[in-house]
Interface confidence: low
C-alpha cells in the first residue's frame, strides 16, 4: 500500500508522458490522476516504466475501478496486463475480440499463464460459445488450446468453428475430447467430396465409431499408420482384415512395425490366423 502524500509543487501530471519515468513511486501516486491515466492508457506501453512504477499505476486503476476495469482501459493495458492477477481479471467483462488479441499479444511466446487462462475463460463465457473467430484467434496464439478444454467445454463449440481447426491444434487431445469433436467435424465437412473430406476429417478420426471407419474403407482413402494408431481401439476391433487392408491401402505394410502396440495388437488378436495370413506380413494372431 503506497502512502498518501501531497504532490510537490509543479509536478502534477498534465498528461502521461516520458517525464513520469523520473518520478519516484510516491510521486506517481500523488501526482498522476487516475482518471487521466485511464483515458491515456494507450501511452503507458510506449514509456519504459519500471515494474515498481507499473505497480503504482495498477494501484491507481484499482482504486478508480474497484468493481473491475472498463473495456476501454483493458484494451490498452499492454504490459500492465502482466501485473494483473486472475482475481483482478475475474472482475472484467471483455467482449471485444480486439481486446482479447491485444492482451494475448502481450503474453505471446510464453506458456498460457493463469491470467491468460482466466481472461480466455471470461471471454468465452461472455460469448456463450467458442465461435469461429475466437477459436481462430486462440489457436493461433496457443495451438494446444482446444485440447486444454474439457469435453463439457468442447460441447459448446459450434460445428462451423471446426473449419478453423488445424491438425496441430489436436495433437494433444485425449480420446474423450476427440469423441466430442469428431461428430462436429463430421457435420461441418459433410458436403465435401470423398478425398477432400478425408483430408479434413483425418485429424478428428480418434473419435470415429466403427461404422464410419467401415464407410471410409470403401473410399480408397489410404489412411497412414500414424492416423490409424490414434483410432479408438473399440472402433478398430470389429473391423475385418479386408476392411483394414482397404482402409490403409499401401500403408497396410506398416502394421508389422506396430504389431505390439494398440490398437494393432488388440485387433490382431481378434482376427482369424487364416485372414491375417492373406496380408503376407507374418502377423501372428
Amino acid at each position: 500500500e503506497v502512502e498518501k502524500t501531497a504532490c510537490p509543487s509543479g509536478k502534477k501530471a498534465r498528461e502521461i508522458d516520458e517525464s513520469l519515468i523520473f518520478y519516484k513511486k510516491w510521486e506517481l501516486e500523488a501526482c498522476v490522476d487516475a482518471a487521466l491515466l485511464a483515458t491515456q492508457m494507450d501511452r503507458v506501453n510506449a514509456i519504459p516504466f519500471t515494474y515498481e512504477q507499473l505497480d503504482v499505476l495498477k494501484h491507481k486503476l484499482d482504486e478508480l475501478y474497484p468493481q473491475g476495469y472498463p473495456e476501454s482501459v483493458i484494451q490498452h493495458l499492454g504490459y500492465l496486463f502482466l501485473k494483473m492477477s486472475p482475481e483482478d481479471i475475474r472482475k472484467w467483462n471483455v467482449t471485444s475480440l480486439e481486446t482479447l488479441k491485444a492482451l494475448l499479444e502481450v503474453n505471446k511466446g510464453h506458456e498460457m499463464s493463469p491470467q491468460v487462462a482466466t481472461l480466455i475463460d471470461r471471454f468465452v463465457k461472455g460469448r456463450g460459445q467458442l465461435d469461429k473467430d475466437t477459436l481462430d484467434t486462440l489457436t493461433a496464439f496457443y495451438p494446444g488450446y482446444l485440447c486444454s478444454l474439457s469435453p463439457e467445454e468442447l460441447s459448446s463449440v459450434p460445428p462451423s468453428s471446426i473449419w478453423a481447426v488445424r491438425p496441430q491444434d489436436l495433437d494433444t487431445c485425449d480420446p474423450r475430447q476427440l469423441d466430442v469433436l469428431y461428430p462436429k467435424a463430421r457435420l461441418a465437412f459433410q458436403n465435401m467430396n470423398g478425398s477432400e473430406y478425408f483430408v479434413k476429417i483425418q485429424s478428428f478420426l480418434g473419435g470415429a465409431p466403427t461404422e464410419d471407419l467401415k464407410a471410409l474403407s470403401q473410399q480408397n482413402v489410404s489412411m497412414d499408420l500414424a492416423t490409424f494408431m490414434k483410432l479408438r481401439t473399440d472402433a478398430v476391433l470389429p473391423l475385418t482384415v479386408a476392411e483394414v487392408q482397404k482402409l490403409l491401402g499401401p500403408h497396410v505394410e506398416g502394421l508389422k512395425a506396430e504389431e505390439r502396440h494398440r490398437p494393432v495388437r488388440d485387433w490382431i488378436l481378434r482376427q482369424r490366423q487364416d485372414d491375417l495370413d492373406t496380408l503376407g506380413l507374418g502377423l501372428q494372431g
Epitope: 487462462a117 480466455i120 486444454s148 495433437d171
Partner: nanobody
C-alpha cells in the same frame, strides 16, 4: 482408485544418468496424458516433461530439454523419464502426475489431479 508409484531415483555423479519409472493403475492409462514434475529442496514444484496418450506433442521444460527423454509403454501402464548429463541443479524429488485438468498447460503444476509420492534424485560428487 488411481495409484502412481515412482521408482528409479538415487545418488548419481554429475554427468551421470538415471531412468525413472512411474507405474500407474486404477484408470485407463492409454487415454491419459502423463507428466513428470520435480521439487528441489526449499523450492516450488515445477514441470519437467509431459507426454500425451498418443506420444505426440511431447513437451519439456527449457531446463531439461535435450538431456531428458520422456516415453511411455501403454502395455505396461508405465511412463519413463530418461535423465542424461545430470547436473547438481537437477537434485530434487521427482513426481509423476495424471488426470489433466482443462484450461491448463501440460507443464502446469495445477494441471493434474493425481500425483505419486515421488522418488528422490541426488546429483553430487
Amino acid at each position: 482408485e488411481v495409484q502412481l508409484v515412482e521408482s528409479g531415483g538415487g545418488l548419481v555423479q554429475p554427468g551421470g544418468s538415471l531412468r525413472l519409472s512411474c507405474a500407474a493403475s486404477g484408470f485407463t492409462f492409454s487415454r491419459n496424458t502423463m507428466g513428470w514434475f520435480r521439487q528441489a529442496p526449499g523450492k516450488g514444484r515445477e514441470g519437467v516433461s509431459a507426454i500425451p496418450y498418443t506420444s505426440t506433442g511431447i513437451v519439456y521444460s527449457d531446463s531439461v530439454g535435450g538431456r531428458f527423454t520422456i516415453s511411455r509403454d501403454n502395455s505396461k501402464n508405465t511412463v519413463y523419464l530418461q535423465m542424461n548429463s545430470l547436473r547438481a541443479e537437477d537434485t530434487a524429488m521427482y513426481y509423476c502426475a495424471t488426470d489433466r485438468r482443462p484450461g491448463t498447460t501440460m507443464l502446469a503444476v495445477n494441471g493434474y489431479n493425481h500425483w505419486g509420492q515421488g522418488t528422490l534424485v541426488t546429483v553430487s560428487s
